[in-house]
């Protein structure tokens, strides 16, 4: 039985050209996390965080994605095309798969107001 829940940063916004941290947290389960996959709105993989082996950033994103903090992911040099859904997929044993959703809105720099809680200055 899957008892866990995923908390995410929810809906966030950030400036074009800036950076943003995507964060998920799995709680309320004793299951072993074997791998966390980060996926973009078109379901392309951004990165994999393996529990024993560390990070693999996908080749297409190596220049714009940085691992961490923790199991999170940092997106850099944001463009308007980065607007959309992002998913963290926790692969666990024995529970199975948990999935969290984050919506990122990239704003033109002139719009200025953006969430600061998970924003890199």
């Amino acid at each position: 039985m899957m008892t866990g829940t995923i908390e995410t940063t929810g809906n966030i916004s950030a400036k074009k050209g800036g950076s943003v941290i995507l964060q998920c947290h799995l709680s309320s389960t004793m299951a072993q996390v074997t791998q966390v996959n980060w996926e973009q709105h078109d379901h392309s993989l951004l990165a994999i965080r393996n529990a024993e082996l560390g990070w693999h950033i996908y080749p297409a994103f190596k220049d714009r994605v940085a691992p961490g903090p923790g199991l999170g992911l940092t997106l850099q040099s944001l463009t308007m095309n980065d607007t959309g859904e992002y998913f963290c997929t926790y692969h666990t044993y024995p529970d199975g798969t948990y999935r969290g959703r984050i919506f990122l809105e990239v704003l033109e720099s002139s719009v200025a107001e953006h969430s600061a809680r998970f924003q890199i200055p």
Epitope: T34, N37, H43, N50, A51, E52, G54, W55, Y58, H91
Partner: antibody, heavy 120, light 107 residues
Framework: EVQLQESGPGLVKPSETLSLTCAVS????????WNWIRQPPGKKLEWIGY???????YYNPSLKSRVTISRDTSKNQFSLKLSSVTAADTAVYYC??????????????WGQGTTVTVSS | DIVMTQTPLSLSVTPGQPASISCKAS??????VAWYQQKPGQSPQLMIY???YRYTGVPDRFSGSGSGTDFTLKISRVEAEDVGVYYC?????????FGGGTKVEIK
């Protein structure tokens, strides 16, 4: 260049423990991931498990209760122990390196493989 | 576990002609797929990772494509040295799993 060489008995009796060692040259096992993969006759390749650069292990849940992977950093080698073997464990056993940072879960170096037969 | 199913089981190709091998995953694995070539009497060799990226030293006649559940390895012009068994593998989730292999022969 990275080279891996499996060694161990080619014949193991049912209910006994299969023991294999992989000697690594040209690279330190304190970097990257070191894996055991097997292929039973006429069947798919099967991941047995791996030991990481830090010594942490992952075992395929289907074999977890019977598998131990360990390492000896002073000899730059790692080992597989598979207990309570049956005929179904007859296979070619490969040791392999995986550079997770660069290639994800894709194995970039394989040993030549060693055939293990389980029979009385 | 994710099941990787390869088709065809075997393939006989005239040198210089193209060849295509299909791999279907039992669930969405995004682009976490690798392809290997195993020549007769040898161990497998990495050809493609992340579905479409050629590994170092792999000739450009080999290409990988696909995402989700359907993946393809193409050889644009088969050469005699390409004979062997080709395997796909997913690493989207543990345990990482392999396809059953496709044997490529020369006519």
């Amino acid at each position: 260049e990275v080279q891996l060489q499996e060694s161990g008995p080619g014949l193991v009796k049912p209910s006994e423990t299969l023991s294999l060692t992989c000697a690594v040259s040209g690279y330190s096992i304190t970097s990257d991931s070191w894996n055991w993969i097997r292929q039973p006759p006429g069947k798919k390749l099967e991941w047995i498990g791996y030991i990481s650069y830090s010594g942490n292990t992952y075992y395929n849940p289907s074999l977890k209760s019977r598998v131990t992977i360990s390492r000896d950093t002073s000899k730059n080698q790692f080992s597989l122990k598979l207990s309570s073997v049956t005929a179904a464990d007859t296979a070619v056993y490969y040791c392999a390196r995986l550079d997770f940072s660069n290639y994800g879960g894709a194995v970039d170096y394989w040993g030549q493989g060693t055939t293990v037969t389980v029979s009385s | 576990d994710i099941v990787m199913t390869q088709t065809p089981l075997s393939l006989s190709v005239t040198p210089g002609q193209p060849a295509s091998i299909s791999c279907k995953a039992s669930q969405n694995v995004r682009t976490a797929v690798a392809w290997y070539q195993q020549k007769p009497g040898q161990s497998p060799q990495l050809m493609i990772y992340s579905a479409s990226y050629r590994y170092t030293g792999v000739p450009d006649r080999f290409s990988g494509s696909g995402s989700g559940t359907d993946f393809t390895l193409k050889i644009s012009r088969v050469e005699a040295e390409d004979v062997g068994v080709y395997y796909c593998q997913q690493y989207y989730t543990t345990p990482w799993t392999f396809g059953g292999g496709t044997k490529v022969e020369i006519k």
